[in-house]
């Protein structure tokens, strides 16, 4: 009743290993690390066979097949490169995930290297089996913004890609009688969120109640350079409109809002987010130079058709930008307190412009980003949002533009976007 001698499978072993096997003896076939027992096309960890009464084995010896992790999962905004020849996906093969640079960067500077484990899953030393995350890079235009040394008071044409965070926000409020149409600007913060001023997204009511416009009435244009040619721009509808809960229409305190886009926008040379500042009650330092871009509204009664169609003279066809210094808070407060009317400049605002006048944020629409270059992180940071100005013509002497101080609202912004700040550290000015 002796059974024939057993040969272990290639890359495998049999236990117990004996010179002879008799009736009722059992052996366990297993495979080396990185290999699986394969029997009748079924993969298993071990396989047991028994010596039968008639001196035959209950089953043939199975084979050992190398573990295959199969095709790795797709990474949103990322690429996969195979380190092993022939794009192998078997045990000990290596792949590397990378993000679509320069528009996305891997969270926590992860190596992106994954190895096919003995268990048949792609494993990273830090993340385990979880995929890495590609976060949008912020504040780094594909085109270098001009040096801030030369003082330019007037507006200039912006080259495409200079202000890739610039958004045109168009509101058609069909719930009003007659229908209201207006526009403003905003700044892209991530693939799905736009930062703007609350007064842009407040329903233009006949009273001072703060009610947001319906999301259905909002359209956002990104990557727009010349309003006569929208073909290259991305247009998106709004999934949510969020006004700051304390926005005060009497003095425009807390003039900040967010629009969540219906779908994340693809980032590229003309569509990239701007960085948020650190939580900083002081805001930007006096005399620092910042840039504001906009399509230069000159007629507040402009209609959407005029904005989007060609031939309009109500705004400049090509995106304009202006360079302005931050004005000391006390100086700005004094300049407004000397005017008749309720012109309080609160701690949630800062001013920018020139004493002698010239161009100011008539060139930027309401809600547009006042950006300052951060030398430390080498990124552009949104420090202000175009909010309001004096009763005189814009650009008048000693009438400064007033901006929402974004650094006071960083926590609120992250909270609305549903992201803990630690997760999005690369987006924060360092």
């Amino acid at each position: 009743n002796e059974c024939p001698e057993l040969q272990p499978p290639v890359h495998g072993k049999i236990e117990p290993s004996q010179a002879k096997y008799f009736f009722k003896d059992q052996v366990l076939v297993s495979c080396d690390t990185g290999y699986k027992v394969l029997k009748d096309n079924v993969e298993m960890d071990t396989f047991q066979i028994e010596c039968l009464k008639d001196g035959t084995w209950s089953n043939k010896i199975p084979t050992c097949k190398i573990v295959d992790c199969r095709a790795p999962g797709e990474l949103e905004h990322g690429l996969i490169t195979f380190s092993t020849r022939n794009n192998l996906t078997t045990y000990k093969s290596e792949i590397k995930y990378s993000c679509q640079e320069p528009y996305y960067k891997m969270l926590n500077n992860n190596t992106g290297i994954y190895t096919c484990s003995a268990q048949g899953v792609w494993m990273n030393k830090v993340l385990g089996r979880s995929l890495p995350t590609c976060l949008p890079e912020c504040g780094q235009p594909s085109r270098s913004l001009p040096s801030l040394v030369k003082r330019i008071i007037g507006g200039r044409n912006a080259e495409p890609g200079l202000f890739p965070w610039q958004a045109l926000i168009v509101v058609e409020d069909t719930s009003r009688v007659p229908n209201d149409k207006w526009f403003g600007s905003g700044a892209l913060l991530s693939a799905s969120w736009i930062l703007t001023a609350a007064h842009v997204l407040r329903s233009q009511r006949r009273d001072t109640t703060v009610i947001p416009v319906s999301k259905e009435h909002v359209t956002v244009y990104l990557g727009l350079h010349d309003v006569r040619d929208k073909s290259g721009a991305v247009n998106s509808s709004a999934a949510r409109v969020v006004l700051h809960p304390d926005f005060n229409i009497q003095n425009y305190n807390h003039d900040i809002a967010l629009v969540q886009l219906q779908e994340p926008v693809p980032l590229g040379p003309h569509v990239m987010p701007v960085c948020l500042p650190r939580l900083e009650p002081e805001g930007p330092a006096p005399h620092m130079l910042g840039l504001v871009a906009g399509w230069g509204i000159s007629n507040p009664n402009v209609t959407v058709d005029e904005i989007i169609s060609s031939g309009t003279r109500t705004l400049s066809d090509v995106l304009q930008y202006v360079k302005l210094p931050v004005v000391p808070h006390a100086e700005c407060k004094t300049s407004y307190e000397s005017r008749s009317g309720n012109y309080s400049v609160t701690e949630n605002m800062f001013c920018a412009g020139y004493y002698e006048g010239g161009k100011d944020t008539c060139l930027g629409d309401s809600g547009g980003a006042f950006v300052i270059f951060d030398d430390l992180s080498q990124r552009w940071v949104v420090q202000g949002l175009v909010s309001w100005g004096g009763p005189e013509e814009c650009g008048s002497k000693q009438v400064y533009g007033v901006y929402t101080k974004v650094s006071n609202y960083v926590d609120w912004v992250w909270e609305q976007m549903g992201l803990p700040q630690s997760v999005v550290e690369p987006q924060v000015e360092r």
Partner: antibody
């Protein structure tokens, strides 16, 4: 077309309560607030308060804070006003309006009498 | 609270005449940010609901005849009917919406 249809006249006893309704049609009910206005016979208009159906926010004239309670039922596009502890001073026509007073209901007469 | 005072309380004019009524507020209704005066004018004909004529002090509501004109800023406002018609017989109310809402006492227009 936009319409605000108010409930019929009410004759109530002093000390009682009454619930008036204002059913909206022809527009998206949640996009605008509903205002309530009181007019005593031969007198002027007095604003009572408003309610915003999208989030149930309310604002009241201080004078009516303890007199009126505003509610909405968005499933039936209807706004309601409860008037409590009625006295003869509350005898009046009550109007609802919407889309920032572009449209008004026909008014509901409330008579408080023993 | 903002107090609205209308004058005169009543006036009688002949058809075709021009009429002006005024409304004063106890504080400015001009919002320095939106640059709008939050004042509206309403017409209420006998036995009817009020009808909005003018908002933002001078913007005529859709469908309102151009003989109705609103003017003024800050605390002093007026409603002018350039050529009174028989159907203009009504009480006219001003209302502030700068801080909640307050109606004026009304001006009763009678046709001689």
């Amino acid at each position: 077309q936009v319409q605000l249809k108010q409930s019929g006249p009410e004759l109530v006893k002093p000390g009682a309560s009454v619930k008036l309704s204002c059913k909206a049609s022809g527009y998206t009910f949640t996009t605008d607030d509903i205002n309530w206005v009181k007019q005593r016979p031969g007198q002027g208009l007095e604003w009572i308060g408003w309610i915003y159906p999208r989030d149930d926010r309310t604002k009241y004239n201080d004078k009516f804070k303890d007199k009126a309670t505003l509610t909405v039922d968005t499933s039936s596009n209807t706004a309601y006003m409860d008037l409590h502890s009625l006295t003869s001073e509350d005898s009046a026509v009550y109007f609802c309006s919407s889309l920032e007073d572009t449209y008004w209901g026909q008014g509901t007469l409330v008579a408080v009498s023993s | 609270d903002i107090v609205m005072t209308q004058s005169p309380s009543s006036l009688a004019v002949s058809a075709g005449e021009k009429v002006t009524m005024t409304c004063k507020s106890s504080q400015s209704l001009l919002n320095s940010r939106t640059r709008k005066n939050y004042l509206a004018w309403y017409q209420q004909k006998p036995g009817q609901s009020p009808k909005l004529l003018i908002y933002w002090a001078s913007t005529r509501e859709s469908g309102v005849p151009d003989r109705f004109t609103g003017s003024g800023s800050g605390t002093d406002f007026s409603l002018t009917i350039s050529s009174v018609q028989a159907e203009d017989l009504a009480v006219y109310y001003c209302k502030q919406s700068y801080n909640l809402y307050t109606f004026g006492g009304g001006t009763k227009l009678e046709i001689k």
